[in-house]
Interface confidence: medium
């Protein structure tokens, strides 16, 4: 099994970043860390989407990675998509330093995110609490600012 992965985030605008993934044991948590720049200040939805297809830009990555057919939620929630990593927070300079540890995603097995697309969104993810149908699907996080396919790293 792969123990490390990497993703280069790019979009049509100024948003770009590099995100690293590491999983020391097959059933253990995945550390996710890196930096994204070019964002507006505040929170931005951060998700793994189903397909590793960026042929038409980030839109072709499909919906959130959701092999268990659950409703959208936050990373701390029982009811969540596998790909629901919550939000990243950008500072006044537009930089979001990402530091996550998640026990639902994996670098192997049924919840493997390798070959899928990581997306950073225009708006905050409401973590499924927005009170409308879109909240239970996307968290009302808005458009896809930048994305990249998650690949195996050395």
């Amino acid at each position: 099994m792969a123990t490390k992965a990497v993703c280069v985030l790019k979009g049509d605008g100024p948003v770009q970043g590099i995100i690293n993934f590491e999983q020391k044991e097959s059933n253990g948590p995945v550390k996710v860390w890196g930096s994204i720049k070019g964002l507006t200040e505040g929170l931005h939805g951060f998700h793994v989407h189903e397909f590793g297809d960026n042929t038409a830009g980030c839109t072709s990555a499909g919906p959130h990675f959701n092999p268990l057919s659950r409703k959208h939620g936050g990373p701390k929630d029982e009811e969540r998509h596998v790909g629901d990593l919550g939000n990243v927070t950008a500072d006044k300079d537009g930089v979001a330093d990402v530091s996550i540890e998640d026990s639902v995603i994996s670098l192997s097995g049924d919840h493997c995110i390798i070959g899928r697309t990581l997306v950073v969104h225009e708006k905050a993810d409401d973590l499924g609490k927005g009170g409308n149908e879109e909240s239970t699907k996307t968290g009302n996080a808005g458009s896809r600012l930048a994305c990249g396919v998650i690949g195996i790293a050395q």
């Epitope: 948590p29 550390k31 860390w33 890196g34 930096s35 200040e41 505040g42 929170l43 936050g74 990373p75 701390k76 990593l85 919550g86 939000n87 990243v88 927070t89 500072d91 006044k92 330093d97 990402v98 530091s99 996550i100 540890e101 998640d102 905050a124 409401d126 973590l127 609490k129």
Partner: antibody, heavy 121, light 107 residues
Framework: QVQLVQSGAEVKKPGSSVKVSCKAS????????ISWVRQAPGQGLEWMGR????????NYAQKFQGRVTITADKSTSTAYMELSSLRSEDTAVYYC??????????????WGQGTLVTVSS | DIQMTQSPSSLSASVGDRVTITCRAS??????LAWYQQKPEKAPKSLIY???SLQSGVPSRFSGSGSGTDFTLTISSLQPEDFATYYC?????????FGQGTKLEIK
């Protein structure tokens, strides 16, 4: 079981510096955001800044910019907060804090016991 | 910076009372609000995050609501151990800011 253990009380002269430590146990130190919050006697809570040890990146409140430096030593799972050019108004209890989940909850779920820094001539 | 204003600053109540503390943000913060309880000479304790999600281990008599700029913390039936100071905190953007606190005292 997560624990944040801070260094002991300090008495400092105006104009000097103080460095407070916060040793973490339980969980993966490098990936968790560590924040520093202070509380002057009889006053409210004030966020000073934070560090992500795995990246070494920091964010500081504008009020403390240039006077505060937050660092982390991953080998000892210890975060540090150094405040320079101390004045009497810096007399406070200084806390380190971290979330229970590193997934950008941005809240402070675990706290150190606090370190009283007294600035007096 | 986002200013957080709590009211009241202090409050006297009796065991069994229902108590509400409000917190107002100077600009919209969606639901990115936490509540803390602090007892004298102790570190604060996390009660609620995301405006309404109860931190694990916190009794269900505590609840939070609100979004945008107006938020409330409600204690449905005060217990002797609830007499403390309560703070709200926004984490919508840096710098994270706290309300000035509400001291809850025994009547």
């Amino acid at each position: 079981q997560v624990q944040l253990v801070q260094s002991g009380a300090e008495v400092k002269k105006p104009g000097s510096s103080v460095k407070v430590s916060c040793k973490a146990s339980g969980g993966s130190f490098s990936i968790y955001v560590i924040s520093w919050v202070r509380q002057a006697p009889g006053q409210g809570l004030e966020w000073m800044g934070r560090i992500i040890p795995i990246l070494g990146t920091t964010n500081y409140a504008q009020k403390f910019q240039g006077r505060v430096t937050i660092t982390a030593d991953k080998s000892t799972s210890t975060a540090y907060m150094e405040l320079s050019s101390l004045r009497s108004e810096d007399t406070a209890v200084y806390y380190c804090a971290r979330p229970d989940s590193p997934n950008h909850s941005n809240t402070f779920d675990y706290w150190g016991q606090g370190t009283l820094v007294t600035v007096s001539s | 910076d986002i200013q957080m204003t709590q009211s009241p600053s202090s409050l006297s109540a009796s065991v069994g009372d229902r108590v509400t503390i409000t917190c107002r943000a100077s600009q919209g913060i969606s639901s990115w609000l936490a509540w803390y309880q602090q007892k004298p000479e102790k570190a604060p304790k996390s009660l609620i995050y995301g405006a309404s999600s109860l931190q694990s281990g916190v009794p269900s008599r505590f609840s939070g609501s609100g979004s945008g700029t107006d938020f409330t913390l409600t204690i449905s039936s005060l217990q002797p151990e609830d007499f403390a100071t309560y703070y709200c905190q926004q984490y919508n953007s840096y710098p994270y800011t706290f309300g000035q606190g509400t001291k809850l005292e025994i009547k």
